[in-house]
Interface confidence: low
Amino acid sequence: DTHKSEVAHRFKDLGEEHFKGLVLVAFSQYLQQCPFEEHVKLVNEVTEFAKTCVADESAENCDKSLHTLFGDKLCTVATLRETYGEMADCCAKQEPERNECFLQHKDDNPNLPPLVRPEVDVMCTAFHDNEATFLKKYLYEVARRHPYFYAPELLFFAARYKAAFAECCQAADKAACLLPKLDELRDEGKASSAKQRLKCASLQKFGDRAFKAWAVARLSQKFPKAEFAEVSKLVTDLTKVHTECCHGDLLECADDRADLAKYMCENQDSISSKLKECCDKPLLEKSHCLAEVENDEMPADLPSLAADYVESKDVCKNYAEAKDVFLGMFLYEYARRHPDYSVMLLLRLAKAYEATLEKCCAAADPHECYAKVFDEFQPLVEEPQNLVKQNCELFEQLGEYKFQNALLVRYTKKVPQVSTPTLVEVSRNLGKVGAKCCKLPEAKRMPCAEDYLSVVLNRLCVLHEKTPVSEKVTKCCTESLVNRRPCFSALELDEAYVPKAFNAETFTFHADMCTLSEKEKQVKKQTALVELVKHKPKATKEQLKGVMDNFAAFVEKCCKADDKEACFAEEGPKFVAASQAALA
């Protein structure tokens, strides 16, 4: 349905609070270096303009598209050229090219200082002094560091952030109440950002067909009692929502997400028995709850898939008549029967089925040719099953930190050209799969592990695209979305890599090591480990373990010394020399 004024339409649909929050997120995700006050000023100007359009939709400029209005506003920023360089050239373009240009300049790894958490009393004072500004600052700081964060979900995080302060700033022990809540929000926020980044990469790099296939598989697992027509409708709507958010159309995205939640709650009977408790909640919470809802129970009477997809003589006919719908139905049928499979595995099976039909439906005897297609699935299923089993055993044997170190070594040997900070970040996150998934029952391990790994490896792909250094990484990232993880798993030691020259400076440590948090200490040690492997890619596990044990002992000794700095100065070179000898 068309509206005379798009900005008035969205303002009325969303309400002032959500409208302002979403515009702030949009601007912060586009202009990631701009100061907070500048963004607040721009948002206030847009909001005042929207109100004039609500009062009179025929008023001047009210008929302009949101991209035109927002782009014009962003292009008024005085320091655009100095701060953003070539991004300022976007302003010379017309819509829709201007918005595409802004999107291309989003920076997944902006050069922003890490957020430092002030003392609890300082935060509570700021919260009480000006709650609105305090919450806007949260939206701004998260959005500029995570330019693809799912905007309506960020409003939900902000609501939880507000609730945490409202509760804990009145508590007897403010810190004990607040800090665990903030830790939880930080960790969930990072996970949410990474998951959304994969959705946007899927849409932007592989197209909406890839995203729709992912959505069919995931929603069929969640809603196995829903009919194919129902799942198709949800997939179409969900694709629209994520296409809008990934494209920077945050107002439309939030509005459509609310409509989708409303539809799901009005049609629970034909979707899932698990939606009831979500549907009683307020909007932001409801949408979050629906997105995270557990899988419904599988219907008891599902017939064998073989009848329709292998044994039937009409397989090629049905396939030829409408390939995408036939494959969509296959994926739906397979996924609803297999909540124990990862979405990526289900997509690989659908791809294998499609390849078999492409080959066999052109053969002399198609039925004979595709009769064994389900047997061909076995190795595809066993590969992630074995991978999960082996890695969970390793995790249980080593614990999280040492498991991360094993992955650091493994991935540095595979792709040593990748920057050390990226290898450390990605391997640490890959290592978190153990604590997240290995404790789960067998039937939930693979979907948890492989779909989580897909999210983490997408982060590697996104960072690598910004600064490409490895043909192997480019190949794994771009050839096939569903085969990214198997592609990385299959990489071996890079024989063509010329080892990095030894640099004593890299292995020089100071007394500040002793005051670091446990996590920061781990990152320092893991950084050194990556550098060691880059220097000696063929070092054995035993050699590396020996050096890392010596390193830990050296740091512990110096941190206990009276003159810590003197100890590091004296013992450091000895450690370096011993390490070089051990790895010679």
């Epitope: 198709s232 599902l302 017939p303 329709d308 009409d314 049905n318 008549e321 409408a322 719908v325 139905m329």
Partner: nanobody, 115 residues
Amino acid sequence: QVQLQESGGGLVQPGGSLRLSCAASGFTFGSFGMSWVRQAPGKGPEWVSAIDSGGADTRYAESVKGRFTISRDNAKSTLYLQMNSLKPEDTAVYYCTIGRSSSRGSQGTQVTVSS
């Protein structure tokens, strides 16, 4: 989005007739083979009949051969099932589906054959 809406069911005496319709939307109906499937109380889905995209090739389950006729009108995006000489064992919910699938794809229409 794909939508299939059946109609025409009802209560009929043994030996009577009914004509079921299935209105399709959200996809290119004329490009698809279509089927009718039924599910009796307490039983699994049973494939009944199929028709190719052009309407030339029709297939029937042994239990309905000679009594049921499947047809389609691509201009109206509608699938039909003419059911004659109905028997009590034809009592079921009838569904139309895309392709030759025994999976239900819609809400269905109840057919009850009883004296």
